[in-house]
Interface confidence: medium
């Protein structure tokens, strides 16, 4: 059944820069990826992108860069300075609407004994929504 | 407000098709996908296949593969669902619905058409 | 594809009582949906992804399970609750819905 994990990691090079990537594990074509912080988006998070396969990138600040890593699986990396940027314990969801089965989001922030460069590998998160 | 509005009744004879509509008000059209379920009298609900409005995806129910076809015009806002080949069994009552899962925002509703008696009968 | 099976097919309550319902998966889900249908309409979704009330619904419904396993609980059963219910999964294609539960009135 459909699951979608999400890696959150903080810059070694840059402290208060930090890269996302969600990815989605499932058979469904893949119609929409939305990335949120501060809870599941439409929830009380702030979208920070939205990846369509077909129309393209839309992205919000503090977002840097979103991108397609594979056909299931993007990345996001957010800039580090200004008062809308990210702390340690910020949550990061992402939100795949995969055609026919639904909207399937998980959330996960930075492991708490993380060092800069260093994260958990990808595991699924757990899902909070399968709409 | 937000409607889906079915075609009127249907009485075919087996081997011939039906073809069922279902126009959509007070919504972005695009912005939803377009499910079919059907019920058999007195039976349970039967998912049918689901239509992406946008990209005019369509996912079938295996039992219907090669049966049916989902349609749409983004124009008039409107889906179609034809079924082929009917026979007896395939006398029920055809609902579309909005599908509740693509949801820009919570909270999630569901909206669903009146119905279409479809009846097969020799 | 994944059979649900609902149980019990009928179920006879008063008013103000507890209902229970339940709906077994063939093989594991991630979620489930709960839908209440009454004579001559259309089905209406109570219940989606397990445990969330969809939009106009009563408090008094909820739901829960993991796995194979789900409920639809109604805390206490108003005279508009004697419906059918049907639980339906999208973990898998083809999506299939349960047989139902008539749930009538003692």
């Known amino acids: 059944t459909p699951e979608v994990w999400v890696q959150v990691r903080m810059e070694a090079t840059e402290l208060s820069s930090f890269t996302i990537r969600c990815g989605f594990l499932g058979s469904g074509s893949i119609s929409l990826v939305t990335v949120s912080w501060g809870g599941p988006n439409g929830a009380g998070g702030t979208t920070l992108a939205v990846l369509h396969p077909e129309r393209g990138i839309r992205q919000w600040a503090p977002a840097r860069q979103a991108r397609w890593e594979t056909q299931s699986s993007i990345s996001l990396i957010l800039e580090g300075s200004g008062a809308s940027s990210p702390c340690a314990n910020t949550t990061f969801c992402c939100k795949f609407a995969s055609f026919p089965e639904g909207s399937w989001e998980a959330c996960g922030s930075l492991p708490p004994s993380s060092d800069p460069g260093l994260s958990a590998p990808p595991t699924p998160a757990p899902i909070l929504r399968a709409d | 407000e937000v409607q889906l509005v079915q075609s009127g009744a249907e009485v075919k004879k087996p081997g011939a098709s039906v073809k069922v509509s279902c126009k959509a008000s007070?919504?972005?059209?695009?912005?939803?996908?377009i499910y079919w379920v059907r019920q058999a009298p007195g039976q349970g609900l039967e998912w049918m296949g689901t239509i992406d409005t946008s990209e005019h995806k369509t996912s079938y129910n295996q039992k219907f593969r090669g049966r049916v076809t989902m349609t749409r015009d983004t124009s008039t806002s409107t889906v179609y669902m034809e079924l082929s080949s009917l026979r007896s069994e395939d006398t029920a009552v055809y609902y579309c619905?909005?599908?509740?899962?693509?949801?820009?925002?919570?909270?999630?509703?569901?909206?669903w058409g009146q119905g279409t008696l479809v009846t097969v009968s020799s | 594809q994944i059979v649900l099976t609902q149980s019990p097919a009928t179920l006879s309550l008063s008013p103000g009582e507890r209902a229970t319902l339940s709906c077994s998966a063939g093989s594991s889900v991630n979620y489930m949906h709960w839908f209440q249908q009454k004579p001559g309409q259309a089905p209406r979704l109570l219940i989606y992804s397990t445990s969330n009330l969809a939009s106009g619904v009563p408090a008094r419904f909820s739901g829960s399970g993991s796995g194979t396993d789900y409920t639809l609980t109604i805390s206490s059963l108003e005279p508009e609750d004697f419906a059918v219910y049907y639980c339906?999964?999208?973990?898998?294609?083809?999506?299939?819905f349960g047989q139902g539960t008539k749930l009538e009135i003692k």
């Open positions: 007070g919504y972005t059209f695009t912005d939803y996908w």
């Open positions: 339906q999964q999208r973990s898998s294609l083809p999506f299939t």
């Open positions: 619905a909005r599908d509740f899962i693509i949801t820009v925002n919570y909270p999630v509703v569901d909206y």
